[in-house]
């Protein structure tokens, strides 16, 4: 005859408020004859949690049909968990006796503790934009979780980052904990379309981590490159000069033309295009009237990008004598 074992496989069961907890208990023998009861705690003050045969336990259901002849599974489910339910639960075998049943063997117990899910991670980037090749810091925060053990990872475009520091508070015992992590990210010129992801894994999430994201587009400033060129062909007595502003981000841009130091107020044609990497190109055309012009016309294309100091490119206009002669003969 096999000696009865009471098997409670989980030492610790983490449950969240409002959910249902399943407490497992199996026996290895049908003998001796008698019921299996569930208690919370030990000793004379222990609380009866479930007795199949008698007592009112509206929150408790059995996993198996206890009336089946060879049933060896005495697992129970407790619904609508509250903080008052924490404690150690024991399944206990009784031997039928007179006048009272006699306790025969107890399981090792399962401690039920409250687990609280972490809040969705919130990722915050730097207050000001930074140019490529520089390092920026991102912070990630999540709150309200329990137990304290938690894993946080950082990713940039799916690649795990290693340069970060993480703190979990408080250090002592608490009902709930918070995590804060700061990651240092080196910006690349193509990072306009990049994302940083903060991933939090916790036992209450059952293998489905929470993620918070931030777009590097909020943190990066890609300064433009400027090129001013003169078109070889002229239109009547006008020469077309082009200012190409390339690979800048964000879109915020002011462009002004100056002719020999005098800012020109007249309208100019321009186009804005977006590159595959998320940066922008801006092309502005400026028509210079070359009739009666001296030879030393200097055009300046000045660009103020995202509130930064203005950058400019100059072009000394090349107007040949032949061009001047032609222009004086040309009809408007």
């Amino acid at each position: 005859e096999e000696e009865l074992q009471m098997i409670q496989p989980e030492k610790l069961l983490l449950v969240t408020v409002g959910k249902t907890a399943t407490l497992h208990c199996t026996v290895t023998s049908l003998l001796p004859v008698g019921p299996v009861l569930w208690f919370r705690g030990v000793g004379p003050g222990r609380e009866l949690i479930y007795n199949q045969k008698e007592g009112h336990f509206p929150r408790v259901t059995t996993v198996s049909d206890l009336t089946k002849r060879n049933n060896m599974d005495f697992s129970i489910r407790i619904s609508s968990i509250t903080p008052a339910d924490v404690g150690t639960y024991y399944c206990v075998k009784f031997r039928k006796g007179s006048p009272e049943n006699v306790e025969f063997k107890s399981g090792p117990g399962t401690e039920m503790a409250l687990g609280a899910k972490p809040s969705a991670p919130v990722v915050l980037g730097p207050a000001a934009r930074t140019t490529p090749e520089h390092t920026v810091s991102f912070t990630c925060e999540s709150h309200g979780f329990s137990p304290r053990d938690i894993t946080l990872k950082w990713f940039k475009n799916g690649n795990e980052l290693s340069d970060f520091q993480t703190n979990v508070d408080p250090t002592g015992q608490s009902v709930a904990y918070s995590i804060r992590s700061t990651a240092r990210v080196v910006l690349d010129p193509w990072d306009v379309r990049s994302q940083v992801i903060c991933e939090v894994a916790h036992v209450t999430l059952q293998g489905d981590p929470l993620r918070g994201t931030a777009n590097l587009s909020e943190a990066i400033r890609v300064p433009p490159t400027l090129e001013v060129t003169q078109q070889p062909m002229r239109v009547g007595n006008q020469v077309n000069v082009t200012c190409q502003v390339r690979k800048f981000y964000p879109q915020s841009l002011q462009l002004t033309w100056s002719e020999n130091g005098n800012v020109c107020q007249r309208e100019t044609a321009s186009t804005l295009t977006e590159n595959k990497d998320g940066t922008y190109n801006w092309t502005s055309w400026f028509l210079v009237n070359i009739s009666d012009q001296r030879d030393d016309v200097v055009l300046t294309c000045q660009v103020k990008h995202d509130g930064q100091l203005a950058v400019s490119k100059r072009l000394a206009l090349e107007v040949t004598v032949h061009q001047k002669d032609q222009s004086s003969d040309a009809t408007p």
Epitope: G45, E47, L48, Q52, K53, E54, G55, H56, L66, T67
Partner: antibody, heavy 114, light 108 residues
Framework: EVQLQQSGVEVVQPGASVKLSCTAS????????MHWVKQRTEQGLEWIGR????????KYAPKFQGKATMTADTSSSTAYLQLSSLTSDDTAVYYC???????WGQGTTLTVSS | QIVLTQSPAIMSASPGEKVTLTCSAS???????LYWYQQKPGSSPKLWIY???NLASGVPPRFSGSGSGTSYSLTISSMQAEDAASYFC?????????FGGGTKLEIK
């Protein structure tokens, strides 16, 4: 729906015996103890005993030992209470109660009278 | 056997009044095994409070239960006309199981 349907009014003579029935529906009778409770007119409640229909094992209050006999028939989901050597003291309403304590039968009124 | 003594045997209360019924056990009863029933004339008793302090389904929240060891109580925070009934405490901590003698609660 859980129900406990008890047998009707019984009027019996002193010294006789009577067998009251309680038929369960909406649950497996073997899953719970069945209790019997006595209530005399305008009086309190007295616990007579309980039976485990699964194996017939029963417990009685000392006062009802020898007076009451509980049995159960799982095939018909019925619990029985037999009362013997009836006297006027046995005149009362008898309730059957499921072991979870929230379901009671409607009661059987027993009158012992010559 | 454990004897449960309820007091008072009869009492009346005005609507809105706070009411406390007591149940005293001759020896210690585990709180898991102390129940209360409400009974109105012509009806079967209804489970009212289980495991000392848990309200059965449908019981108004003005009812509460407390106690431990040998001293238990049922409290109505604000008496209502429909609360007029008999209340019985019940222990199933040890055989033989026993009921208290009951408290008949009337409305003034």
């Amino acid at each position: 729906e859980v129900q406990l349907q008890q047998s009707g009014v019984e009027v019996v003579q002193p010294g006789a015996s009577v067998k009251l029935s309680c038929t369960a529906s909406g649950f497996n009778i073997e899953a719970y103890y069945m209790h019997w409770v006595k209530q005399r007119t305008e009086q309190g409640l007295e616990w007579i005993g309980r039976i485990d229909p699964e194996d017939g094992e029963s417990k009685y209050a000392p006062k009802f030992q020898g007076k009451a006999t509980m049995t159960a028939d799982t095939s018909s989901s019925t619990a029985y209470l037999q009362l013997s050597s009836l006297t006027s003291d046995d005149t009362a309403v008898y309730y059957c109660v499921r072991g979870s304590y929230e379901y009671w039968g409607q009661g059987t009124t027993l009158t012992v009278s010559s | 056997q454990i004897v449960l003594t309820q007091s008072p045997a009869i009492m009346s209360a005005s609507p809105g009044e706070k009411v406390t019924l007591t149940c005293s056990a001759s020896s210690s009863v585990s709180s898991s095994y102390l129940y209360w029933y409400q009974q109105k004339p012509g009806s079967s008793p209804k489970l009212w409070i289980y495991s000392t302090s848990n309200l059965a389904s449908g019981v108004p929240p003005r009812f509460s239960g407390s106690g431990s060891g040998t001293s238990y109580s049922l409290t109505i925070s604000s008496m209502q006309a429909e609360d007029a009934a008999s209340y019985f405490c019940y222990q199933w901590s040890s055989y033989p199981y026993t009921f208290g003698g009951g408290t008949k609660l009337e409305i003034k």
